[in-house]
Interface confidence: medium
């Protein structure tokens, strides 16, 4: 049976970083994923690329070069994305989602010509196509409304970190998080910690079997799962203690909702 394939650095202000974590060394963590990330290098005073293993590490790690520069370089102002001339969207806005060949896990945005909106998808880190934006705002400016730039969108919405139906996953089923609304469990909006603690357990793409722990935002506990050694996401810890230390602190006590701390 034959199957058909779908078509598919800036000037520095002060030398003192804006945040103490910007002075931390790049930490790839103990996991074996290969995720292209960025860190602020205190010695060169620039944001540089490094490979992140997919779990643990430290706060001097950013998904995009832009995010790194904005966070760690004093006086860095985001250069405005030039809108396309006239009301025409560039041709690449109409390209279908292409996660790319590589096995990274990068949050990106694409223009969906069916819904006429910019949506989140997961990019593997190489190849793919040009319908691929580092920020929702950039996607909107170029593809949704190329003439009238919309007001900036706050990117760090908790829903952005939850795998949704538009995300291409590395398995055939899309792994949605369903958070039960019983009075004993925290809802997503009651969580103010690290956003990856809301991601589902992801065993990854390889063939190893390693004991790992993930934080379950519905139960407020860290549970065991088997990790295959590469890929997956940041909700992946080598010990239950590290998992709890990283994610449990985000729970907010709320008497009316009975959230367990």
């Amino acid at each position: 049976l034959s199957e058909e394939a779908d078509d598919t650095d800036s000037e520095l202000g002060s030398m003192k970083p804006l945040h103490t974590f910007c002075a931390m060394k790049a930490d790839d963590g103990p996991c074996k994923a290969m995720i292209r990330s960025y860190f602020f290098n205190m010695y060169t005073h620039q944001c540089e690329e490094f490979i992140y293993g997919g779990c643990e590490g430290n706060e001097n790690r950013f998904d995009t070069l832009e995010e790194c520069k904005k966070t760690c370089i004093p006086g860095y102002e985001k250069t405005a994305v030039k809108a396309a001339s006239g009301a025409e969207r560039p041709d690449f806005c109409f390209l279908e989602e292409d996660p790319g060949l590589c096995r990274g896990y990068m949050k990106r945005y694409l223009y969906n010509n069916q819904t006429k909106q910019c949506e989140r998808f997961v990019y593997g880190g190489c190849l793919g196509n040009r319908n691929n934006f580092e920020t929702l705002d950039e996607c909107k400016k170029i593809c949704e409304n190329p003439v009238h730039s919309p007001s900036p969108v706050n990117e760090v919405q908790m829903s952005d970190y939850v795998t949704d139906g538009n995300t291409v996953t590395d398995r055939s089923t899309v792994n949605n998080i369903v958070v039960p609304q019983s009075p004993k469990v925290p809802r997503r909006r009651d969580y103010r910690g690290r956003p990856w603690c809301l991601q589902p357990a992801d065993s990854g793409l390889c063939k190893a079997s390693e004991r790992r722990f993930y934080y379950n935002s519905a139960t407020g506990k860290c549970h065991r799962f088997n990790y295959t050694g590469c890929g997956g996401n940041n909700n992946n810890f080598t010990t239950r203690r590290r998992c709890l230390r990283s994610c449990k602190t985000g729970l907010i006590k709320n008497k009316s909702k009975g959230v367990v701390k």
Epitope: D6, D7, R103, L127
Partner: antibody, heavy 121, light 108 residues
Framework: QVQLQQSGPGLVKPSQTLSLTCAIS??????????WGWIRQSPGRGLEWLGF?????????SYAVSVKSRITINPDTSKNQFSLQLNSVTPEDTAVYYC???????????WGQGTLVTVSS | DIVLTQSPATLSLSPGERATLSCRAS???????LAWYQQKPGQAPRLLIY???SRATGVPARFSGSGSGTDFTLTISSLEPEDFATYYC?????????FGQGTKVEIK
């Protein structure tokens, strides 16, 4: 050890369709994290990447602009192989055609033996 | 498209000498996605280096790769008779993947 075995005619007439097949052993055409592609080499052009297919949650392909309107690369999961079709060929398409496995992080680590395709009447 | 320019076009050296091959990209390429290949007449290319500096399985330690951004280098520390061949760089960072035009290393 991944091995790729190419098959297909070495002579194609102008305006006809060039068809080549690449049989895979030691891996699966549906494997996650690898792409299966075609590259050609002619004295005038050097190595030219034509395109590839790969599977994540569904099949994806990517083609070079120079051949995009004429090329199709398809997987055949039942035979664990993939094929190249290049329509409306001209003598400019005369080249040695290679199939290759592109690893997601590791380059083209396995190649077919190459097939010299001559476009001539 | 990212254009990769290799230099020199031909390198004439003797066995035992050090070979330094250059690959320059028209725009920045992630070092994770740059590879080097060796090709001998009548044969398919053979992967030598991936991720700009990682040796592929079975590749001798005399081959090393380095570089970042737009400038990448393949070094053969001491040429053996079997190393005389044509070498290509390839980027697989962005679509379309592209190759350099090649550097031929010939016996002086």
């Amino acid at each position: 050890q991944v091995q790729l075995q190419q098959s297909g005619p070495g002579l194609v007439k102008p305006s006809q369709t060039l068809s080549l097949t690449c049989a895979i052993s030691g891996d699966s055409v549906s494997s996650n994290g690898a792409a299966w592609g075609w590259i050609r080499q002619s004295p005038g052009r050097g190595l030219e990447w034509l395109g590839f297919i790969y599977r994540r949650s569904k099949w994806y392909n990517s083609y070079a602009v120079s051949v995009k309107s004429r090329i199709t690369i398809n997987p055949d999961t039942s035979k664990n192989q993939f094929s190249l079709q290049l329509n409306s060929v001209t003598p400019e398409d005369t080249a040695v055609y290679y199939c290759a496995r592109q690893d997601g992080m590791g380059g083209m680590d396995s190649w077919g033996q190459g097939t010299l395709v001559t476009v001539s009447s | 498209d990212i254009v990769l320019t290799q230099s020199p076009a031909t390198l004439s050296l003797s066995p035992g000498e050090r070979a330094t091959l250059s690959c320059r990209a028209s725009q920045s390429v992630s070092s994770f996605y740059l590879a080097w290949y060796q090709q001998k007449p009548g044969q398919a290319p053979r992967l030598l280096i991936y991720g700009s500096s990682s040796r592929a399985t079975g590749v001798p330690a005399r081959f090393s790769g380095s570089g970042s951004g737009t400038d990448f280098t393949l070094t053969i520390s001491s040429l053996e008779p079997e190393d005389f061949a044509t070498y290509y760089c390839q980027q697989y960072d962005s679509t379309p993947s592209t190759f350099g035009q090649g550097t031929k290393v010939e016996i002086k």
